[in-house]
Interface confidence: medium
């Protein structure tokens, strides 16, 4: 399973982003895959 | 775990009416709940969010006209001055999920 | 705002047949791109996220490629159930100046 934490973009420049996390399953208890800040 | 918006009804323009999405099986405020409309036999469209840690986020054409808030146990969609353009079904989702609402339906007409 | 524009409106496929959706982001999303399937008076239901992976329970007739600005739904050998309208959906996230979750406007996907 899969879940997508908060990560905060840096591109372009001065814009921090958050993306919605994902919840394929529907369950809480899934592992959570982070994805990496990006500049 | 399911959601369940409540709420819609018939209102006339101008009227202010608040949805109400409650969670079954998990807290609504450990997660990003979204809230997307559609219109009868329109597509979807998105409102607005609100993350986990509260922090609410609107479509343009969204901003001023609804109101996204949370208590304990719901999250709350305020449609401040309904026009005729806002008849729709209303979901709650729970992020990017299969976890969907059944929809509220809100019509505005005079 | 995010803009996703979704062609064809419509398309007629035969049982066992392939059909192909494209989705356009206004800008790029990466893979941050979601594809659902609705019925009449049901809810949305998730069928593949992050462009390409396939949500729990969904059959690899389904098929989601692309990423950037430029992603395809491929849905083969198609069956009656298949009939339905199909949306894509980005979540790029949002910022004070910007709302990166935009749905395109659907693809009616008739089985004959």
């Known amino acids: 399973s899969y879940s997508m934490e908060h990560f905060r973009w840096g591109k372009p420049v001065g814009k921090k982003r958050r993306p919605v996390k994902v919840y394929p399953n529907g369950a809480e208890d899934e592992s959570a895959e982070a994805f990496p800040l990006e500049f | 775990q399911s959601l369940e918006e409540s709420g819609g009804r018939l209102v006339t323009p101008g009227t202010s009416l608040t949805l109400t999405c409650t969670a079954s099986g998990f807290s609504l405020s450990a997660y990003d709940i979204l809230w997307v409309r559609q219109a009868p036999g329109k597509g979807l469209e998105s409102i607005g969010m609100?993350?986990?840690?509260?922090d609410t986020y609107y479509a343009t054409w969204a901003k001023g006209r609804f109101i996204i808030s949370r208590t304990s146990t719901t999250m709350d969609l305020k449609i401040i001055s309904p026009t005729t353009e806002d008849t729709a079904t209303y979901f709650c989702?729970?992020?990017?999920?299969?976890?969907w609402g059944q929809g509220t339906l809100v019509t505005v007409s005079s | 705002d995010i803009v996703m524009t979704q062609i064809p409106a419509s398309v007629e496929a035969a049982v066992g047949g392939t059909v192909t959706i494209k989705c356009q982001a206004s800008?790029?999303?990466?893979?941050?791109l979601a594809w659902y399937q609705q019925k009449p008076g049901q809810p949305p239901k998730l069928l593949i996220y992050s462009a390409s992976t396939l949500a729990s329970g969904v059959p690899s007739r389904f098929k989601g490629s692309g990423s950037g600005t430029e992603f395809t739904l491929t849905i083969g050998d198609l069956e009656c159930a298949d009939a339905a309208t199909y949306y894509c959906q980005s979540y790029d996230g949002s910022s004070s100046s910007y709302y990166g979750i935009g749905f395109g406007g659907g693809t009616e996907v008739v089985v004959k």
């Open positions: 800008q790029s999303i990466d893979s941050s």
């Open positions: 989702v729970k992020g990017v999920s299969n976890i």
């Open positions: 609100m993350y986990d840690d509260g």
